[in-house]
Amino acid sequence: SAPFSFLSNVKYNFMRIIKYEFILNDALNQSIIRANDQYLTAAALHNLDEAVKFDMGAYKSSKDDAKITVILRISKTQLYVTAQDEDQPVLLKEMPEIPKTITGSETNLLFFWETHGTKNYFTSVAHPNLFIATKQDYWVCLAGGPPSITDFQILENQA
């Protein structure tokens, strides 16, 4: 798409991990769980131990973008959340280490993190009009908005 090719020459350099072991809950208070190995989905949990714990790494853009650009990794793994296309599930991509530099087609690993009060939004850098979203009876995917849920609460320090 046009936005993707426009951004593809921007280089993103890894800075540091800024959050460890947090849980993402959607607006229906469903937690993200790992389903069937490479997929994520949302479910109302009795036991929060079933919720995925994420780490968040920050990247700095060569374009000096004001937006906070992040990568999402499942804690204690080498699995990174990877965007596909609109309404397609996000996938878990295994990489030996966190990428030091990301550019071009690899920007599907990156998200712009925006906060509005307690609401958190993750926009795909590769598809800037699409958000990480939950959808009833479906996987965590990329979506532009309703009926998918695009706002998340970050739960930290869950024992």
Partner: antibody, heavy 122, light 107 residues
Framework: EIQLVQSGAEVKKPGASVKVSCKAS????????MNWVRQAPGQDLERMAW????????TYADDFKGRFTFTLDTSTSTAYMELSSLRSEDTAVYFC???????????????WGQGTTVTVSS | DIQMTQSPSSLSASVGDRVTITCRAS??????LNWYQQKPGKTPKLLIY???RLHSGVPSRFSGSGSGTDYTFTISSLQPEDIATYFC?????????FGQGTKLEIK
């Protein structure tokens, strides 16, 4: 209540085939992978294969490639294991077990079927 | 593949005893260690996941600990109904191997 209910015991002759079913209830079938585990008489647990219940893709442990086939019927939340060209050494209890990731990083098998005994004898 | 070595292979203890079983992984498994109980002629049951978390409905006399490559399963006060074989299993990387099992008997 989460339950995995397997089909009943089977007695087969060498060279025959057997198909074991595992019907799941009490949870969203496609959200959790399914495992098949073998326990031969007096032996330890061996994880034979695991199935992505969304895509139907099976991943086999090295010792179980060839004569084993694992299938799904998502409309009835049922997993199947088929074993062809049966041999006496296939005599064992076969379990299905739901796979779950704790924290997204640690895999366990939290609910198990009651087991299906397959006896191969001439 | 990660290998799991469980010890002892069998043990005999009296009712009320504290019982300990160990499991060693061939490499660091980051606390991704589960324990299962299998009573004679029955299906395995998940007792403990992620080193120390009790699965729902499991009595508190069962516990787990450890880190890195070395893990321990403990029954604080052995009960007659605890007669079973206990298996560890690593949940870090495929193929998520089981240990060889420890058969627990009452003296």
């Amino acid at each position: 209540e989460i339950q995995l209910v397997q089909s009943g015991a089977e007695v087969k002759k060498p060279g025959a085939s057997v198909k074991v079913s595992c019907k799941a209830s009490g949870y969203t079938f496609t959200n959790y992978g399914m495992n098949w585990v073998r326990q031969a008489p007096g032996q330890d647990l061996e994880r034979m294969a695991w199935i992505n219940t969304y895509t139907g893709e099976s991943t086999y442990a090295d010792d179980f490639k060839g004569r084993f086939t694992f299938t799904l019927d998502t409309s009835t939340s049922t997993a199947y294991m088929e074993l062809s060209s049966l041999r006496s050494e296939d005599t064992a209890v076969y379990f299905c077990a739901r796979g779950i990731y704790y924290y997204g990083s640690s895999y366990a098998m939290d609910y198990w079927g009651q087991g299906t005994t397959v006896t191969v004898s001439s | 593949d990660i290998q799991m070595t469980q010890s002892p292979s069998s043990l005999s203890a009296s009712v009320g005893d504290r019982v300990t079983i160990t499991c060693r992984a061939s490499q660091d498994i980051s606390n991704c260690l589960n324990w299962y109980q299998q009573k004679p002629g029955k299906t395995p049951k998940l007792l403990i996941y992620y080193t120390s978390r009790l699965h729902s409905g499991v009595p508190s006399r069962f516990s787990g600990s450890g880190s890195g490559t070395d893990y321990t399963f403990t029954i604080s006060s052995l009960q007659p109904e605890d007669i079973a074989t206990y298996f560890c299993q690593q949940g870090k990387t495929l193929p998520y191997a089981f240990g060889q099992g420890t058969k627990l008997e009452i003296k």
